[in-house]
Amino acid sequence: GILNLNKMVKQVTGKMPILSYWPYGCHCGLGGRGQPKDATDWCCQTHDCCYDHLKTQGCSIYKDYYRYNFSQGNIHCSDKGSWCEQQLCACDKEVAFCLKRNLDTYQKRLRFYWRPHCRGQTPGC
């Protein structure tokens, strides 16, 4: 769920998601449209696709709570939970490390980016 995601992103990136990423660019945060603005925004667009696929599978992406361990900078998703919980954890783990990989190109100007400026073709999944 959303609490899992926030905690994981903070642990991996060291940033407070609510202050740094939700929202950011055209795809980080709720919803998303248009061409991603940078690599960080692409992370979120890919994550949206990951969630969309799990929605198709009937997973409750915002409500399902999963278990994971964070140690020595790595995330280990529990294999004890349901398939949906494991996949949700995998989606969130991927976006957390994607955001971390792209910290060096993070642009403060894209924080609270005005969504009507998000133009162009929304990438397909």
């Epitope: 990951c50 696929h53 198709t56 599978q57 009937g58 409750s60 349901s82 949906c84």
Partner: antibody
């Protein structure tokens, strides 16, 4: 244990509507999608659509968009499918089914045979 | 919509032998390391029963003589050794995208 209870039969006249029920028990009704599947006599299975009881979010197979309407009553843990403008082509067994983990159907109702006849 | 083509439409297998049922999808149902193909058994007058999910995972309580394999567009359900109680119609179903669709079914008869 998980149960999805459906009435055995519904006899309706051509042009009329019918509301098929599916009462769930043995699990938290609002947590999982409820699906509806049609099976004409001697034929295969067709997915009609699904509804999430927590917020009534629905997805329909376009083929059934104008034929079926899915609703839920959370207070009684019951899902409904209304079929309108019935013709003999709609005579079939209608199943409700729920998926607990991914979009494969773990639990099924016994099915309701809808017969459209004058 | 993804079309699932099952073959054969019917088959007769001797007790203790192997039954092989094929399901071919009109486009790939595999992505992100999973194949979104599932198998059901249906006996007359009963609802379908889940046998295999995600191409090869055995549903709890289903005998180990049932197995599934495949990826992309080609999938197989194997039953070995076949028992009398396996006489039924078998359906594949995908969940790669909406709408979900089923194969046309394969009727298994035990000789």
């Amino acid at each position: 244990q998980v149960q999805l209870q459906q009435p055995g039969t519904e006899l309706v006249k051509p042009g009329a509507s019918v509301k098929v029920s599916c009462k769930a028990s043995g699990y938290t009704f609002t947590r999982y999608w409820m699906h509806w599947v049609r099976q004409r006599p001697g034929q295969g299975l067709e997915w009609i659509g699904r509804i999430h009881p927590s917020d009534s979010d629905t997805n329909y197979n376009q083929k059934f968009k104008d034929k079926a309407t899915l609703t839920v009553d959370k207070s009684s843990s019951t899902a409904y499918m209304q079929l309108n403008s019935l013709t003999s082509e709609d005579s079939a067994v209608y199943y409700c089914a729920s998926n607990w983990d991914g979009a494969w159907f773990n639990y099924w109702g016994q099915g309701t045979l809808v017969t459209v006849s004058a | 919509d993804i079309v699932l083509t099952q073959s054969p439409a019917s088959l007769a297998v001797s007790l203790g032998q192997r039954a092989t049922i094929s399901c071919r999808a009109s486009k790939s149902v595999s992505t992100s390391g999973y194949s979104y193909m599932h198998w059901y058994q249906q006996k007359p007058g009963q609802p379908p029963k889940l046998l295999i999910y995600l191409a090869s995972n055995l549903e709890s309580g289903v005998p180990a003589r049932f197995s599934g394999s495949g990826s992309g567009t080609d999938f197989t359900l194997n039953i070995h050794p076949v028992e009398e109680e396996d006489a039924a119609t078998y359906y594949c179903q995908h969940s790669r995208e909406l709408p979900f669709t089923f194969g046309s079914g394969t009727k298994l008869e035990i000789k």
